[in-house]
Interface confidence: low
């Protein structure tokens, strides 16, 4: 799709002028290349009428100019003294006429409306309400009041005071007669349609003494706001439709062929499958305004979006709307990272979250996207030391590796952890990214005992078995707390016997706690990493109890509970409830998580650009 954008339709009347603004991505090449305005011929081809290089066709001599605004990526074509001969199909574009970097514009010049004297002009946005005021004299106070619309040569009755309503206006029009002190009646038309535009006549009385008033109604289609966002980034559509539709269902739709507008999301619970996991419709204000956030932008997300209000939750004639034209910039500053991360039950994932490196001091967040209630994303963890209670001991947000990336580690995985997660910051909202965690068949790579009990004052040794595939990785033990996982000294005990068909490169690395105290109770993780890039982890909970018998405890896989699997995790103290509590911090300035925080794109290893961008959580 061409990145050039302008008005699809321009309407004017003879003798008037028009200004047509065409937008282009303001790259250095585009800023300096030729800009043109040409008229499309019946057999194809496009005849240049004016260009930025100084050419002006004889048809436009003395009545047109083209001005480039390179700083903001626009150029403007002004055409004066319009005639009906100027009606037709045009292109505004960059470079060579035939190259395709252009936008089609339809110019319609109609005969002057020849407005009658004393015509009141009403200019109202599509979907809104107009009140046409009709004065009358005392002698007509008791007589029939009516409003007609001029259709061709004939006035057609729209509404009258005897109760008639034209079928085209059913359910959206009323006639109000003011108190006798005010000699005025009003016709109120709601949910204005483009077809409502035209000339109206209101009348009090039916004889030669009737009072008449002419009105010209112009219904404006909203010009789309232009939005350029980066591939893999996010966009927020703020929709302010006014308090009169505060209690009407809201929607965001994307225009497809013709006038069709496919619902992307609405407040009635509908959501397009292509946006699963990456969209939030934020709670609306009392004034009826709301916003929609889409993350993980794809090329195919580009297009025309409309937000509106209608009881059906979708675009209907007369819906008040706002419009945007979204372009997705493929030369993205947001790094490519996996959109899917895979882990096994009982295992772990490490997700790498990009953020704007200029904002290293920003607070980092990770949240779990939920489809209910039009989509929401309750926080699970942040970089300030807060972890949701149900995730204690198995979730950590690390500032490493830094310089534009932070890491989130989630272990003790169960099938309930499958879903979409967002990485956010309180800084640049365009850097929200999203990742899907999938739970697949398999065994965790790291093997640790289940529940471990240490005795006060004694020594505890906890083993962690690393398979040979991790031979080149750094192995570590750490003690989990809300702010991360503090590294502890560990001891390489030589080859592990826990893996079948594996050579001497399998390792057993033990955590030793000397003279155990109450403070040693808690979650311990063993894991692998390469520098500041983290791989798999396994968690062990160490309980501390009073001495019963002398000696140290050396815990082995055989003596302790089995390595955690989903059944273990679903019982006892390790049960993980995935009930998300809405966190008020999510709805700060722009009312939704997605508005003030970034989102995450995946786990850590490199991605084959030709792949489906999936990343395994079990093998790095």
């Amino acid at each position: 799709k061409s990145p050039i954008f302008g008005p699809e339709e321009v309407n004017s009347v003879e003798g008037n002028s028009v200004s047509i603004t065409c937008y282009y991505p303001p790259t250095s090449v585009n800023r300096h290349t030729r800009k043109y305005w040409c008229r499309q011929g019946a057999r194809g081809g496009c005849i240049t009428l004016i260009s930025s290089e100084g050419y002006v066709s004889s048809k436009y001599a003395g009545r047109a100019n083209l001005t480039n605004f390179p700083e903001n990526g626009t150029f403007v074509v002004n055409i004066a003294q319009l005639s009906q001969d100027d009606s037709g199909r045009y292109k505004c574009g960059l470079g060579i006429n035939s190259r395709g970097l252009s936008f089609d514009v339809s110019l319609e010049v109609s005969q002057g409306p020849g407005l009658l004297n004393d015509t009141k002009v009403y200019t109202v946005d599509l979907g809104r309400t107009v009140t046409i005021n009709c004065p009358f004299k005392t002698e007509n106070a008791q007589k029939r009041k009516s409003l007609y619309k001029q259709i061709g040569l004939y006035p057609v009755l729209v509404i009258d005071s005897s109760g008639y309503v034209n079928p085209n206006y059913t359910g959206r029009i009323r006639l109000d007669i003011q108190g006798t002190g005010q000699l005025l009646f009003s016709v109120v038309i709601n949910q204005l349609r483009l077809s409502d535009a035209g000339q109206y006549l209101c009348q009090a009385g039916d004889d030669s003494n009737s009072n008449k008033k002419n009105a010209d109604l112009q219904v404006l289609k909203p010009e789309p706001e232009l939005v350029y966002e980066d591939l893999r980034g996010s966009v927020t559509f703020h929709c302010a439709l006014g308090p009169e539709v505060a209690n009407v269902a809201k929607f965001l739709c994307r225009q497809s062929s013709g006038e069709n507008c496919d619902v992307v999301v609405n407040t009635l619970g509908k959501r397009a499958p292509a946006f699963e996991g990456r969209i939030l419709l934020n709670p609306q204000d009392k004034d009826g305004s709301f916003s929609v956030v889409i993350t993980g932008l794809r090329k195919e997300d580009a297009g025309r979006y409309l937000c509106g209000a209608h009881s059906d939750g979708q675009l209907q004639e007369g819906s008040p709307i706002q419009a945007w034209q979204l372009f997705v910039n493929e030369e993205s500053t947001i790094p490519r990272s996996p959109t899917v991360v895979k882990g096994v039950a009982g295992g772990s994932v490490a997700v790498l979250c990009p953020y704007n490196r200029k904002e290293s001091k920003s607070i980092k967040y990770w949240c779990l996207w939920e489809g209910a209630q039009n989509g929401r994303c309750p926080l699970l963890v942040d970089s300030e030391g807060w972890v949701k209670a149900q995730y204690e001991g198995r979730l950590s947000l690390l500032e490493e590796p830094g310089n534009g990336t932070f890491t989130v580690i989630l272990n003790q995985l169960t099938s309930r952890d499958a879903g979409f997660y967002w990485c956010l910051t309180n800084g640049d909202t365009l850097w929200r990214t999203t990742v899907e965690i999938k739970i697949i068949e398999g065994e965790p790579n790291l093997k640790v005992p289940g529940n471990v009990t240490a005795v006060l004052g004694e020594t505890l040794k906890v083993p962690c078995h690393f398979p040979c595939k991790f031979s080149s990785y750094e192995k570590y033990w750490c003690k989990w707390n809300n702010t991360g996982c503090q590294a502890l000294p560990s001891q390489d005990e030589g080859p592990s016997k826990a893996f079948v068909n594996c050579d001497e490169n399998s390792r057993l690395v033990s955590l030793t706690l000397n003279l155990v105290t109450r403070a040693d109770e808690g979650w311990y993780w063993c894991g692998v990493k390469q520098g500041h890039f983290y791989g798999e982890t396994a968690a062990v909970y160490v309980a501390v109890e009073e001495r019963k018998a002398a000696g140290s405890r050396d815990v082995s896989l055989a003596k302790a509970d089995a390595a955690p699997d989903e059944k273990v995790l679903d019982s006892g103290f390790r049960e993980i409830e995935n009930k998300a509590i809405q966190d008020p911090r999510l709805f700060a300035e722009e009312k939704a998580v997605a508005d003030t925080r970034d989102q995450a794109d995946g786990s850590r290893a490199s991605v084959d650009s030709g792949s489906s961008e999936e990343q395994g959580g079990s093998s790095r």
Epitope: S19, Y23, N72, V76, E223, V227, H238, T429
Partner: nanobody, 116 residues
Framework: EVQVVESGGGLVQAGGSLRLSCAAS????????MGWFRQAPGKERSFVAA????????GYGDSVKGRFTISRDNAKNTLYLQMNSLKPEDTAVYYC?????????WGQGTQVTVSS
């Protein structure tokens, strides 16, 4: 009646700061992108900064990036331009515009003079 009125201009020394305001009335402020433009003596009017109707995105001319900040208060129907680290070449009449890229509503301008 549509009105776009700039204020806050004046004389300031190089390196100093000024904050321009633009009060809008007579149209639905929240429906339009807003912008600041400037015109130095003997030069064409040039783009300074623009902000989307919601305030969620903004753009700046190359010569002011990092020094000027555009913002808006939709509750007050007011547009602002915070100008820091002013240079003599910033001397110009500054214009506020509603829907500037669609030949929208323009103010009369406010003079900013930066002395060295």
């Amino acid at each position: 009646e549509v009105q776009v009125v700039e204020s806050g201009g004046g004389l300031v020394q190089a390196g100093g700061s000024l904050r321009l305001s633009c009060a809008a009335s007579g149209f639905t402020f929240t429906r339009y992108a807003m912008g600041w433009f400037r015109q130095a003596p003997g030069k064409e009017r040039s783009f300074v900064a623009a902000i989307s109707w919601s305030g969620s995105s903004a753009g700046y001319g190359d010569s002011v990036k990092g020094r000027f900040t555009i913002s808006r208060d939709n509750a007050k129907n007011t547009l602002y331009l915070q100008m820091n680290s002013l240079k003599p070449e910033d001397t110009a009449v500054y214009y506020c515009a509603a829907d500037p890229f669609n030949q929208g509503y323009w103010g009369q301008g406010t003079q900013v003079t930066v002395s060295s």
